[in-house]
């Protein structure tokens, strides 16, 4: 008994297209093997039609393709066009065509329905707008004119020129009677329905003498668009509907089971909680065009999504949509990486974001994610030496370790840094990836001082104390600007004695500046890292004034004012246009954005041993 | 909302055959599928067939315990669906039950309850030796 699995009968009509899904365990080794469809001769071989390896025979050339979902342990076969010569069996397969895996599957392609003469076919999209013409002799110019559905044996009335509008049909449909120079009324019907498809008879007049004229209206549901990612990366839905409904409301939902379709996001403000931090819905073109971009995929959401418009902001009967069918690769060529990273007040986050390794020399960018109106992704950084104003001095974007990771720092950290941001590049966009940061309670590891005043001339030395259980951790001081961070000598004064509970293992590790000039002003970072994982980081403000007195300064924790948010920011500080994702595509041209928030931020991260998909600033 | 209910269902010798409906209301699909599960007393809930038909076409699936003896067809018109059972034997005993979705996704296993939105209550078909 074969494990392949599939339809075992297939009926449809000459010119109409199949989609024949062929199910098969999906282990391994069947997930990577040949997939094909061959159709059974008369003396039992069966002839390959078209296989997964690229082959297609000259009989379905242009008019079929087979696609494998390995995740789902299926693989489709499409066929357009069918004629009668269709009919016959058929096997879908898996290895070689006589080896026994496989399905026997029969297609029956029997002659289409005729059509009555004279009958003019209407072949019209879901939710948009069909106009059936009926011509009409000069005789029947003042008489009645009507169109009717016919349901089964009978024709029933759906508008008629003296005011009847059926049911069904109430607030979207309307009958237009020509100048008088034409002969000729038009029945407009708006938001079309699936069920109103069928054959309908347009009649001027009433009398054996009456003008009749048979239309056959076929509402075409959209076939979904197979869309295939990788876990962990990210989707863009493309939503082009036309103009016509360029200022209705538009959404984005995903089918869950019957008619139910959940708004994942829509234009009126509303979006499902799962896609909190990891969806953006891009403002729409003038023609009312507008995308989606999912990023952190998930297992769960593969589906089945639909974008459209409708005044609801959701599906409903006569919406014109778009289709996709989503797939979330499970083998996935994006590394995990933490989804959520812990920090204090006062203290730092470690960020390690991926990218893809082939495009090491693309730019890389971090945004925060914010969730007003549709969601936008404004900039805060990026690896060309573009810092956010409000962030300087405290936001780091470094291209270490490399190979496809790079590293964002954030350190004094506020109850305002919690949130989503991004990790992006310029380069393959299915690579976005996000991360939550969460401001837990705690105090920083690392002690320094808060902000210091330096003395032309002097010598300045700044205290950073690391706790024992960096001990076995690399430390560092170095001096901020918007490249990165140069690290600067520092010299290890033995333990600290600024930690209870702390043995030896503790240090001291003190920042010397000799000679202090104007060019010493500036942020300074203490840290630690291991190779090149970076871990916490302490961040200090120094000021550099005259005076008369000479001698050296020796800063102390006591003598700091340790207020983590403070900033001391010289005048001369350039502020740069903030920078928003707006175009999921990224960066075809940089936009500039008004950003209203204004946010002091910084953080530590503490290790959730609780959860593999945590990472705390501290760990490695 | 819609609502399924079965008939058809009874006492049937070995050999013999019944035919079991699934009658739909409560709106009419366009496209869509109707499939027929059945559960023997302490056992899990199995497919029997469906029925699936989009744009004109119909394609029909069996389990492989069936073939050749059950056959799945539907009344357009009146929504229904039916199940031909022949040459029935004592292991064919279950509750029967009719499920049914609006165009389920093409990619997920039809032989799996999860694809199905609607239920019915079942239909007892019990055949003796």
């Known amino acids: 008994k074969s494990p392949i699995f599939g339809p075992e009968e297939v009926n449809s009509v000459e010119g109409n297209s199949v989609s024949i899904t062929c199910y098969y365990p999906p282990t391994s080794v069947n997930r990577h093997t040949r997939k094909y469809w061959c159709r059974q001769g008369a003396r039992g071989g069966c002839i390959t039609l078209i296989s997964s390896e690229g082959y297609v025979s000259s009989k379905y050339a242009g008019r079929a393709n087979l696609t494998n979902f390995p995740e789902n342990g299926t693989f489709v076969v499409n066929i357009a066009q069918l004629s009668q010569d269709d009919s016959g069996r058929y096997k879908c397969g898996l290895g070689i065509n006589s080896r026994g895996l496989s399905f026997d599957v029969s297609l029956e392609v029997s002659q289409g329905p005729g059509l009555l003469n004279d009958t003019k076919v209407y072949t019209v999209d879901l939710g948009r707008t069909v106009t059936i013409n009926c011509p009409f002799k000069t005789e029947n110019a003042q008489k009645r004119k009507s169109l009717y559905k016919q349901i089964g044996l009978y024709p029933v009335l759906v508008i008629d020129s003296s005011g009847y509008v059926n049911p069904n049909y109430t607030g979207r449909i309307r009958l237009d009677i020509q100048g008088t120079g034409q002969l000729l009324f038009s029945v407009v019907i708006n938001q079309l329905r699936l069920s109103d498809a069928g054959q309908y008879l347009c009649q001027a007049g009433d009398d054996s003498n009456s003008n009749k004229k048979n239309a056959d209206l076929q509402v075409l549901k959209p076939e979904p668009e197979l869309v295939y990612e990788d876990l962990r990366g990210s989707v863009t839905f493309h939503c082009a509907l036309g103009p016509e409904v360029a200022n209705v409301a538009k959404f984005l939902c995903r089918q869950s089971s019957g008619e139910n379709c959940d708004v994942v996001v829509n234009t009126l403000g509303k979006r499902a909680p799962a896609f909190e931090g990891r969806i953006l819905l891009n403002p729409q073109d003038k023609d009312g065009s507008f995308s989606v971009v999912i990023t952190g995929l998930r297992k769960e959401d593969a589906g089945r999504y639909l974008c459209g418009a409708h005044s609801d902001g959701q599906l409903q009967e006569g919406s014109p949509i778009q289709a996709w069918q989503l797939f979330v690769n499970e083998e996935s060529t994006i590394p995990r990486s933490p989804t959520v990273v812990k920090g204090v007040a006062g203290g730092s986050v470690a960020v390690l974001c991926p990218y893809n390794r082939k495009e090491s020399k693309s730019i890389k960018y971090w945004c925060l994610w914010e969730g007003a109106q549709n969601g936008r992704c404004p900039l805060l950084v990026d690896s060309e030496g573009w810092v956010k104003a409000q962030y300087e001095g405290r936001l780091s974007l470094l291209e270490e370790p490399g190979n496809g990771t790079f590293t964002v720092i954030l350190n004094q950290l506020t109850s305002r840094d919690a949130g989503f941001y991004w990790c992006l590049t310029n380069g393959d966009t299915l690579w976005r990836t996000t991360v939550e940061i969460k401001i837990i309670e705690g105090e920083p590891n690392l002690k320094v001082p808060g902000n210091v005043t330096a003395v032309l001339g002097e010598t300045l030395k700044v205290p950073c104390h690391f706790p024992c259980k960096f001990s076995s951790y690399e430390k560092y001081w170095c001096k901020w600007n918007n490249t990165g961070c140069q690290a600067l000598p520092s010299q290890d004064e033995g333990p600290s004695k600024a930690f209870v509970n702390c043995d030896e293992n503790s240090r001291l590790v003190s920042l010397t500046l000799n000679l202090v000039t104007r060019a010493d002003e500036g942020w300074y970072w203490c840290g630690v890292k291991q190779g090149h994982f970076y871990g916490e980081t302490a961040a200090v403000y120094v000021a550099v004034e005259e005076r008369k007195a000479a001698g050296s300064r020796d800063v102390s924790l006591a003598k700091a004012d340790a207020a983590p948010d403070e900033k001391v920011l010289d005048s001369g500080f350039r502020e740069i246009e903030n920078k928003a994702i707006q175009d999921p595509r990224l960066f075809a041209e940089e936009k500039a954005v008004a950003d209203t928030r204004d946010q002091a931020d910084g953080s530590r991260a503490s290790v959730d041993s609780g959860s593999s998909e945590e990472q705390g600033g501290s760990s490695r | 909302e819609v609502q399924l209910v079965e008939s058809g269902g009874g006492l049937v010798q070995a050999g013999g055959s019944l035919r079991l409906s699934c009658a739909a209301s409560g709106r009419t699909f366009s496209s869509g599928i109707m499939g027929w599960f059945r559960q023997a007393p302490g056992k899990e809930r199995e497919f029997v067939a469906a029925?699936?038909?989009?744009?004109?076409?119909?394609?029909?699936y069996y389990a492989e315990s069936v073939k050749g003896r059950f056959a799945i067809s539907r009344d357009n018109a009146k929504t229904t669906a039916y199940l031909q059972m022949g040459s029935l034997n004592p292991e064919d005993t279950a509750l029967y039950y009719c499920?049914?979705?609006?165009?389920?996704?093409?990619?997920?296993?039809?032989?799996?309850?999860?694809?199905?939105?609607?239920w019915g209550q079942g239909t007892l078909v019990t055949v003796s030796s």
């Open positions: 029925i699936e038909w989009s744009g004109g076409n119909t394609y029909k």
């Open positions: 499920a049914a979705d609006e165009s389920p996704s093409r990619y997920i296993d039809l032989r799996r309850p999860a694809p199905y939105h609607y």
